[in-house]
Amino acid sequence: ARPRTELLNVCMDAKHHKEKPSPEDGLHKQCSPWKKNSCCFANTSREAHKDISYLYRFNWNHCGSMTPACKKHFIQDTCLYECSPNLGPWIQEVNQSWRKERILHVPLCKEDCEQWWQDCRTSYTCKSNWHKGWNWTSGYNQCPEGAACHPFHFYFPTSAALCSEIWSHSYKVSNYSRGSGRCIQMWFDPAQGNPNEEVARFYARAMS
């Protein structure tokens, strides 16, 4: 874990992140809430909205077409990961070829997980951990041999399962609600400020 002084207003040492957060006026669509203070560049935010973008060559449509309602949560998830300067308390060192740091056990507000899970009910996948085990021979992820496509609820029977398992426990579901100052919101209205600043401060204090 990082020293206490580096838990607030920091960017991960990962594939596309800035070294330090700064304003980024041209952030695209769903990433725009982070434009006042961002760890992502404008071109990263544009790529976050694309299928099989250059960011990670990740194919959301690996089991047929993902519904727009579902996909927008994965875009928002990407924006949070790439752009948020408020994930410092959960940054961990990692020995991976493509990044030196990752997030672990970020407490996502329960409503954000519930909404994500409900909106992906009618989409399909073939795996419960999307970080590993794919067939990448085509240059993008495809289902490995023997992994059958089923509705999301088959692989993620609860909203907690979706949030915690999909990215190797990068997230966990918080028991706290949006607006509590105790959980990270994937979705927020920037007109009312970034609520995750207060959350990061709370957990940084708790960890010191």
């Epitope: 309602a69 927008k72 329960k110 409503e111 954000d112 997980c113 519930e114 909404q115 409900q118 909106d119 909203s159 609600s177 949006r178 607006g179 979705w187 927020f188 209205d189 007109a191 009312q192």
Partner: nanobody, 127 residues
Framework: QVQLVESGGGSVQAGGSLRLSCAAS????????MGWFRQAPGKEREAVGG????????YYADSVRGRFTISQDNAQNTVYLQMNSLKPEDTATYYC????????????????????WGQGTQVTVSS
């Protein structure tokens, strides 16, 4: 405060459909969270579902998921509740509610989160 007016209630046979409307006025916010609730005589108020108009994100109570659909018409400042495959147990007075808060998930189903309420419209489903 937001002014809310519901319409579209009435009587229908089981298996039938109705569409309720909730027209909002008198607010300056860009976006609203709007919820639908219902109350049958002698019973507790029950959440039906809700929508955050900024992202058109909807969330439903288990009792109606798959049968009811909430949608919006931004030009008309109106939110709709399309009710299909109606059952006698759907009989109730239906209310819409609104708040400028950004609600999603089960937050949309919490009556304490809303500060403006309509007068309600009656729905009767006979077998």
């Amino acid at each position: 405060q937001v002014q809310l007016v519901e319409s579209g209630g009435g009587s229908v046979q089981a298996g039938g459909s109705l569409r309720l409307s909730c027209a909002a006025s008198g607010y300056t916010y860009r976006r609203l969270s709007m919820g639908w609730f219902r109350q049958a005589p002698g019973k507790e108020r029950e959440a039906v579902g809700g929508i955050y108009t900024g992202e058109s994100m909807t969330y439903y109570a288990d009792s109606v998921r798959g049968r009811f659909t909430i949608s919006q018409d931004n030009a008309q400042n109106t939110v709709y509740l399309q009710m299909n495959s109606l059952k006698p147990e759907d009989t109730a007075t239906y209310y819409c509610a609104a708040t400028p808060q950004f609600l999603i998930g089960s937050g949309l189903l919490r009556p304490d989160k809303y500060d403006s309420w309509g007068q309600g419209t009656q729905v009767t489903v006979s077998s």
